[in-house]
């Protein structure tokens, strides 16, 4: 990964665009730390493995997080 060894944060730009939970391969929530001062949300899409940074403050993204955690709680026994 070109910048990973030298940068603290992962996201260059962030997106407000809602993501269909069905098209998600993975959703990573990286908490703020000494390496990066802000929460970062990285969505990995099933199509082509595209990774997209999402805006943690966006209403649509907050709804997505709720939907994903609901889905997870349904699956876990």
């Amino acid at each position: 990964v070109p910048l990973s060894r030298t940068v603290r944060c992962t996201c260059i730009s962030i997106s407000n665009q809602p993501v269909n939970p069905r098209s998600l391969e993975k959703l990573e929530i990286i908490p703020a730390s000494q390496f990066c001062p802000r929460v970062e949300i990285i969505a990995t899409m099933k199509k082509k493995g595209e990774k997209r940074c999402l805006n943690p403050e966006s209403k649509a993204i907050k709804n997505l997080l709720k939907a994903v955690s609901k889905e997870r709680s349904k699956r876990s026994p």
Epitope: T10, I12, S13, P37, N55
Partner: antibody, heavy 124, light 109 residues
Framework: QVQLVESGGGVVQPGRSLRLSCTAS????????MHWVRQAPGKGLEWVAV????????YYADSVKGRFTISRDNSKNTLYLEMNSLRAEDTAIYYC?????????????????WGQGTTVTVSS | EIVLTQSPGTLSLSPGERATLSCRAS???????LAWYQQKPGQAPRLLIY???SRATGIPDRFSGSGSGTDFTLTISRLEPEDFAVYYC??????????FGPGTKVDIK
Amino acid sequence: QVQLVESGGGVVQPGRSLRLSCTASGFTFSQYGMHWVRQAPGKGLEWVAVISYGGDIKYYADSVKGRFTISRDNSKNTLYLEMNSLRAEDTAIYYCAREGEGSNIYYYYGMDVWGQGTTVTVSS
Amino acid sequence: EIVLTQSPGTLSLSPGERATLSCRASQSVSSSYLAWYQQKPGQAPRLLIYGASSRATGIPDRFSGSGSGTDFTLTISRLEPEDFAVYYCQQYGSSPIFTFGPGTKVDIK
């Protein structure tokens, strides 16, 4: 509409300084990484610098490292390029460009919006 | 440092013909990091393709990108009069972080 407008170019002597500005409108500037790219007369494109949406990530081309500084003021929707110790080879059109939505260090969405450029001429 | 080479330097074609532009990297480049741009005289560049094969918003489907590793291709299936321009490939990688190829000029035969 989505727009980037550069300003601050002009004729300057070698060794002097200049500050370029790029004013954004029509989109939420504070959510996008921004670049400076230049093009010398009759030549191809040369990337100069990038800054992330929050200003945490800043990278420079080797040709300008230590002389140029990229910065942004999200409250003013403005990107800057501070250029010091200017050389004749810095003569070019300077474009500001927006990094694609959601771009990150793992996936590059390209530079999807460009300004029309501002001309910098370094000459004695 | 990864160097991008574009060929041919100039491509002379007629409207309606197919254009195939090549971009070769000196080392392997992830397709996640490869983009193509179009630039017309006196204008700013315009993003055509990102991720080696994904069309940017508003780009007609006659433009397509393909390739992986060190060899990438931009194809224009049927040239329209407005497609005559210079095309640049670009990669995002280690220092210098973003690199453009030297460009391919597509001109009218």
